[in-house]
């Protein structure tokens, strides 16, 4: 019987034949930075080269005896469960591990740091096929660190790591607090975040996504075919350095964007039971466990787009949080969100020559968060259009004026403290879909976007009372590029995007008593691109 | 996930230029920062990463560590280059006391400086 | 203490539907994943669906698919199981079941006394 | 899909006796296996969960054992109050879904 965890990211139409390197030219390489490794494991044998690098902290206590066996465990379980021939996920991939780690299983950020850059002065001097570098391991925040693995990841190199066994946001720790890294927590057999003794998965917005990380039988250092069982989110991190290996050795010419969308566009969606996380964080927390791509054919032509959330803004009045998508991503919607209510909404800027999502704060405001909408649109040409507060009761509206521009997008931004309280919302006027709409006092921007038979449309979801929720999806075929409420009155917390789906979210009308406000509409934006589903229907 | 310049809680000590023996002050305006990790028992003091400016070539990260060597005997303190940093980020790891911080804040090309620490296998 | 109580079973025509409410109380209702569970007549358990009532998320078993839909009330602590287009084979005791979190496992440990629902000209 | 079968069906035994019932799992399901106690006219009620754990106000005399695809409840002693039907139910993944056994009766003999 195949363990649950490689029947957990196998989906049911999987073609494993697909998963071979076209040629042998384009052979994936996995570094692993961890404890030494037995290399002669069944297992590993042949598949993982040890290199020379070794940075590592003396072991802690006068009376610590070395054990090649316990040395050994943590990496050669990983390196097993990446690319171990029986239990691997990757069964053919080609490692080197790197020992940054001691027989405690503790190392430093500057070893860290000089593993990581030893792997680029590699890459340097023998360029070859893709590279993914698994760091199963975490530290407190440090700068430093995250700075390494941004000049990495934009070198072409593909990093996965732990998101942290801490059962606390993810963001304190790092490496799984760089935006570049593909950040994994642990689930179970079950789907549920995993318990670690007292603690257990960290969770948070710098998680990527979820991955088999308990109970997950690999190679054991305690003999050549000994096998053992074990849990954290380095189990989980290497889980999706192998689905990441198999899908590039499959598409070899994948950008570290396009795969990290491809992750998160074929996990299971809506799998894991977030009570187990804090409430303040579980909407910020993926609801996505990693799988394989069922086919690698026709993944290309579809539109890719993630959530991505800012850290939060902090309490003071004119506070802002700022979410910012990768370099090879398209920023295509922007969208706040305060649990107290009091927000001055969102809008679209240009800095440093790309768009980011600014979410602003208002007087008496806990805090808010900017969501951004970050998709993968090659040629794309997108600007930002806005319309200044109107000055008549009709409300504020802009539309896309340029020929061939989509609206992908709306935001909306005020000045007043509470706005829409005692106002009636605005209605878009019937047959003008193409437009954003907003209240009269607030400015409205909206993302117009023009590539290559891009086409968009609107669909809204409205509820004639409050409700905690309401949401609008986008159908089969379609992706959510926007995701926004019509417009904001003051129960309003915000609006954000969940997979395809747009979530609108008020205040709890059980404990406001207020049911006097009006209608709560959620705004979807959905897309697709007409050339890319041709090409699409061809290939089938 | 998290932005590049950090909001979250490490410690950053922003210490200003002030005249001193060999030190060029840092360009005008700008002022290097320290870092530390939240985690006090994960803290490793002694060891230091000095992250010198994005375009900083391997010859002035190699000088500027002689130079921190070179002030801090004068001051009669030991230090210790362990590893010069290129290929990903300039800088260099330096033993050291935490006394001379603020001297080495102020070498030029500094960005900043983070005090290493512990981590661990998950 | 932790009590869940169903109601709304009762007599239906075939080709009908009907609604089964689940009222909770002695727990944070929003906290808990909530279950709906069948058992016909000498038969065994079959599970249904569920609802997690803190986001509306729902699952439901494929042979259910278009035929039930759990819904919540989080203001009454309520559960609900709509069941359309109802046949004589969905005579049955109808169960809800709280989903309780028990050192990194999970499972149904509390369930109402059931509802019975006779579908029948 | 996950097909749980359990076995016996149904048995007969007496006060004092050691009753072992079976679980299999069609697929691996690690140790996420529950057993449910259900009388005749009343709801199921929980027994063990994760393939071992007692539920608390459960009589020891219940164990669980297992994992991956082959479990098993023991009742060490039968008690007169344990006349019932034992069902073992797991976690499908594959339709987000939750899989019951076929049940196992325990009448007296």
């Known amino acids: 019987s195949i363990p649950w965890n490689l029947e957990r990211i196998t989906p049911p139409r999987y073609r494993a034949d697909e998963y071979q390197p076209p040629d042998g030219s384009s052979q994936v390489e996995v570094y692993l930075l961890d404890t030494s490794i037995q290399s002669d494991h069944r297992e590993i044998e042949g598949r993982v080269m040890v290199t020379d690098f070794e940075n590592v902290p003396e072991e802690d206590g006068t009376r610590f005896h070395r054990q090649a066996s316990k040395c050994d465990s943590h990496g050669t379980h990983l390196a097993g469960v990446v690319s171990g021939r029986d239990a691997g996920v990757a069964k053919g991939a080609s490692m080197r591990s790197l020992r940054v780690l001691n027989c405690q299983g503790k190392g430093t950020v500057s070893g860290t740091l000089i593993g990581l850059e030893f792997i680029r002065k590699s890459q340097l001097i023998q360029p070859s096929g893709p590279l993914v570098v698994l760091l199963p391991l975490a530290g407190g925040y440090s700068r430093v660190l995250n700075a390494a693995c941004q000049r990495l990841a934009r070198a072409g190199v593909v990093l996965v790591t732990a998101a942290g066994n801490f059962r606390d946001d993810a963001c304190l720790y790092s490496p799984a607090s760089a935006p570049e890294v593909i950040t994994v927590g642990a689930t179970n057999a079950q789907d549920q975040p995993v318990t670690l003794g007292t603690l257990g998965t960290n969770f948070g917005r710098c998680v990527d996504l979820f991955a088999p990380g308990e109970d997950i039988i690999g190679a054991s250092s305690d003999c050549s075919t000994c096998f053992v069982s074990q849990s954290g989110t380095s189990q989980a991190a290497a889980h999706v350095a192998g689905i990441a290996a198999m899908m590039l050795s499959a598409e070899p010419e994948l950008t570290l964007a396009e795969l990290r969308q491809r992750l998160i566009h074929f996990s299971a969606k809506d799998v894991i039971n977030e009570a187990w996380f804090p409430e303040d964080q579980r909407v910020l927390t993926p609801n996505l466990v990693a799988a394989l791509p069922p086919s690698t054919h026709g993944a290309g032509w579809q539109l890719f787009c993630r959530t991505v959330w800012s850290a939060h803004s902090g309490p003071t009045r004119m506070a802002t949080a700022v979410a910012r998508c990768a370099p090879d991503e398209e920023l295509l919607s922007c969208s706040s969100f305060s649990r107290s209510g009091k927000r001055r909404g969102e809008r679209m800027e240009a800095q440093g020559g790309k768009l980011v999502c600014r979410a602003h704060n208002a007087f008496g405001g806990e805090g808010v968060y900017a969501i951004a909408r970050c998709c993968l649109l090659p040629q794309a040409n997108c600007s930002v259009h806005t319309a200044p507060p109107a000055e008549a009761s009709m409300g504020t509206r802009v539309h896309c004026h340029q020929q061939g521009h989509v609206l992908t997008g709306c935001s909306s931004h005020w000045e007043v403290e509470d706005l829409g309280t005692h106002k009636p919302p605005v209605l878009r006027p019937r047959g003008q879909p193409n437009q954003c709409v907003g209240h009269r006092e607030a400015s409205i921007h909206a993302s117009c976007c023009h590539a290559p038979g891009l086409e968009c449309k609107v669909k809204e979801h409205g509820i004639p009372a409050p409700q905690e929720q309401v949401t609008v999806a986008c159908e089969e075929g379609w992706t959510l590029t926007g995701c926004s409420a019509l417009p904001g009155t003051s129960h309003v917390l915000g609006a954000y995007a969940v997979d395809n789906t747009c979530v609108v979210r008020s205040r709890d009308v059980s404990t406001t008593g207020s049911t006097s406000e009006g209608a709560v509409t959620a705004v979807a934006i959905c897309c697709r691109s007409r050339h890319l589903a041709q090409a699409s229907q061809e290939l089938q | 996930q998290e932005d590049e310049d950090g909001d979250y809680e490490e410690l950053v000590l922003a210490l200003r230029s002030e005249e001193d023996g060999l030190a060029e002050a840092p360009e005008h305006g700008t002022t290097a920062t320290f870092h530390r990790c939240a985690k006090d028992p994960w803290r490793l003091p002694g060891t230091y990463v000095v992250v010198l400016k994005e375009e900083t070539h391997l010859s002035q990260s190699e000088r500027t560590a002689r130079r921190l060597q070179a002030q801090a005997a004068r001051r009669g303190y030991l230090t210790k280059i362990l590893h010069v940093f290129h290929g990903l980020l300039p800088g260099f790891l330096v033993k050291m006391s935490g006394d001379l911080l603020e001297l080495a804040l102020k070498l030029p090309h500094v960005d900043y400086i983070e005090e290493d620490s512990s981590v661990f296998a998950q | 203490e932790v009590q869940l109580l169903e109601s709304g079973g009762g007599l239906v025509q075939p080709g009908g539907s009907l609604r089964l409410s689940c009222k909770a109380s002695g727990y944070t209702f929003s906290s808990y994943w909530m279950h709906w569970v069948r058992q016909a007549p000498g038969k065994g358990l079959e599970w249904i669906g569920r609802i997690d009532p803190y986001n509306g998320g729902t699952k439901y078993n494929e042979k259910f698919k278009g035929k039930a839909t759990i819904s919540r009330d989080n203001s009454k602590n309520t559960l609900y199981l709509q069941m359309n287009s109802l046949r004589a084979e969905d005579t049955a005791v109808y169960y809800c079941a709280r989903y309780g979190y028990y050192l990194g496992s999970y499972a149904m440990d509390y369930w109402g006394q059931g509802t019975l629902v006779t579908v029948s000209s | 899909d996950i097909q749980m079968t359990q076995s016996p069906s149904s048995l007969s035994a007496s006060v004092g006796d050691r009753v072992t019932i079976t679980c299999r799992a069609s697929?691996?399901?690690?140790?996420?296996l529950t057993w449910y106690q259900q009388k005749p006219g009343k709801a199921p009620k929980l027994l063990i969960y994760a393939a071992s754990s007692l539920q608390s106000g459960v009589p020891s005399r219940f164990s669980g054992s297992g994992s991956g695809t082959d479990f098993t409840l023991t009742i060490s002693s039968l008690q007169p109050e344990d006349f019932a039907t034992y069902y073992c139910?797991?976690?499908?993944?594959?339709?987000?879904?939750?899989?019951f056994g076929g049940g196992t009766k325990v009448e007296i003999k």
């Open positions: 139910q797991a976690y499908d993944y594959s339709l987000s879904g939750y899989v």
């Open positions: 697929q691996d399901v690690s140790r996420y």
